[in-house]
């Protein structure tokens, strides 16, 4: 069968090979399409109610005044010339409709590096067959499920026209230190070959790089956290962030029941004060941030002081907050 591609709404003429150019003609057209149950026969004498959809012209050709989705299928003509020689014509008709130019809607003006962001939704309306939508970054195709790229697609069909509406939502996770103004575009590729893709106007969101939180520093006095019994230890929690966050203290992973303060003084150290200390800075804009842990231990006279970070005993002596 000869493949014919016709645009929806346009006229189509299928030639009946071997048919005499003028009546009388001995020919018949057979149709097996979305409009028929099995085969429908049309003759030059007129198809009556079918004339609005397909009719045989005086030269034997079949004329479809406005091709529709239901006209997809097989068209066959059987003709006999004046000498009684029979000729058959066989056509496979497929129809298409090019949608309007796709558009990116709900597009983001700003993306945040390091986290997933919705870039926008690409919409194509009025295609047949459905076709596909694809996204491009700086002119190169974006592959879903690779490098923080995800795409959510939806296809709807108009109940009356049978044409398709496609939607594609793009999510990306921009790399830190990457392009500050990436260019995204979306293109529609028709379901039938030999038709070029349609591309949206590009969008260029800004990529915002969140400033990484500077670490919470815990300073111990004396250095190393080893003191003689009865000595004093001062722990200072240094947070560069502005405004100053609230500082709470932890011992052996348990919050100490003390009011917030950036300095913790342990006077007259006893065995019960030994343990692992850390501070927690709570910012209003983002969650709590914990410092490294330091070990406070008691050294008997004549002992070498342990290195910072060694684990001492537990217990809680007298605490002073500056």
């Amino acid at each position: 069968a000869q493949n014919i591609t016709a645009r929806i709404g346009e006229p189509l003429v299928l030639k009946c090979k071997g048919a005499p150019k003028k009546p009388p003609q001995r020919l018949e057209w057979k149709l097996n399409t979305g409009r028929t149950e099995a085969w429908k026969v049309l003759s030059p004498q007129g198809g009556g109610p079918w004339d609005s959809v397909a009719r045989v012209l005086p030269n034997g050709s079949l004329f479809l005044p406005a091709v529709g989705i239901q006209d997809e299928g097989i068209f066959r003509c059987q003709a006999m010339n004046r000498n009684g020689k029979e000729t058959k014509s066989n056509y496979r008709v497929r129809v298409y409709q090019i949608p309007g130019k796709p558009e990116i809607v709900d597009s983001a003006s700003e993306l945040t590096a390091g986290v997933p962001n919705k870039v926008g939704t690409c919409v194509s309306e009025g295609s047949y067959p459905a076709g596909t939508l694809s996204w491009h970054l700086d002119g190169k195709p974006l592959v879903p499920n690779e490098k923080g790229v995800s795409v959510k697609e939806q296809t709807r069909r108009h109940p009356e026209t049978g044409l398709f509406t496609l939607q594609s939502e793009l999510m990306v996770t921009p790399a830190r230190g990457g392009d500050p103004r990436p260019t995204f575009s979306c293109s529609f590729s028709p379901g039938l070959p030999r038709h070029r893709a349609l591309r949206t106007a590009p969008i260029q969101p800004r990529v915002w790089e969140p400033v990484p939180l500077e670490e919470v520093q815990l300073v111990v006095e004396p250095e190393g956290g080893a003191v003689a019994p009865g000595g004093t230890v001062t722990l200072t929690c240094e947070v560069p962030a502005q405004p100053s966050p609230q500082i709470h203290w932890m011992k052996d992973g348990v919050p100490l029941p003390l009011p917030p303060s950036p300095v913790l003084i342990l006077p007259e150290i006893g065995p019960q004060d030994q343990g692992t200390y850390s501070c927690v800075a709570t910012h209003s804009s983002h969650g709590p941030q914990e410092s490294r842990a330091v070990s406070i231990s008691i050294i008997e006279p004549g002992e070498e002081g342990p290195t910072a970070g060694s684990v001492g005993g537990s217990g809680l002596g007298t605490l002073a907050l500056a």
């Epitope: 409009r35 028929t36 007129g46 079918w50």
Partner: antibody, heavy 119, light 107 residues
Amino acid sequence: EVQLVESGGGLVQPGGSLRLSCAASGFTFSNYWMSWVRQAPGKGLEWVASIKNDGDNTYYVDSVKDRFTISRDNAKNSLYLQMNSLRAEDTAVYYCARGGDITTGLDYWGQGTLVTVSS
Amino acid sequence: DIQMTQSPSSLSASVGDRVTITCRASQSVGSYVNWYQQKPGKAPKLLIYRASSLADGVPSRFSGSGSGTDFTLTISSLQPEDFATYYCLEFDEHPLTFGGGTKVEIK
């Protein structure tokens, strides 16, 4: 709202003529085939004639061929049936109906106009 | 010409009954069959188009089925306003042909 209103019916002698009209509203008249259907008193429905939306092609039941002519004026949203050489068996209520091709069949109908052929 | 044989020509039924009317075409007409309801002194009203699609504003108790040569109109639960005459129509070929009608009467 689709509306079809027939007029022009009446009493006519055998061999006489009558012209029926149908005024259409509520839809794009030029997009649709139009038809006439009749119903003899106490009988069933009988298709009489159809005309394509552009008026180029007309179709008739055998019993009225060469006597009846269907026509339309798309500018006036009107359908007509010119009936000549009327016979007693043409006595019926004549309905104007939208459609007549495979896209819809006959979907909307007028209220009908009575044609009586009698001496 | 295509003949449309409709049966029964009349039937008596009660409110709430399930009613089935059939039309048989003398040759295949695809799915190009409509069903109509007509009340005395009124124009026919489209109920079902293309064999099985319900026309706008028609109650869902009406349904149509079939293709090719055999077609059925079903009223799932007959209501008082459904007592009328019903016609099938084939519109696959000219002349368009109606069935002879089925008069649904109160039992």
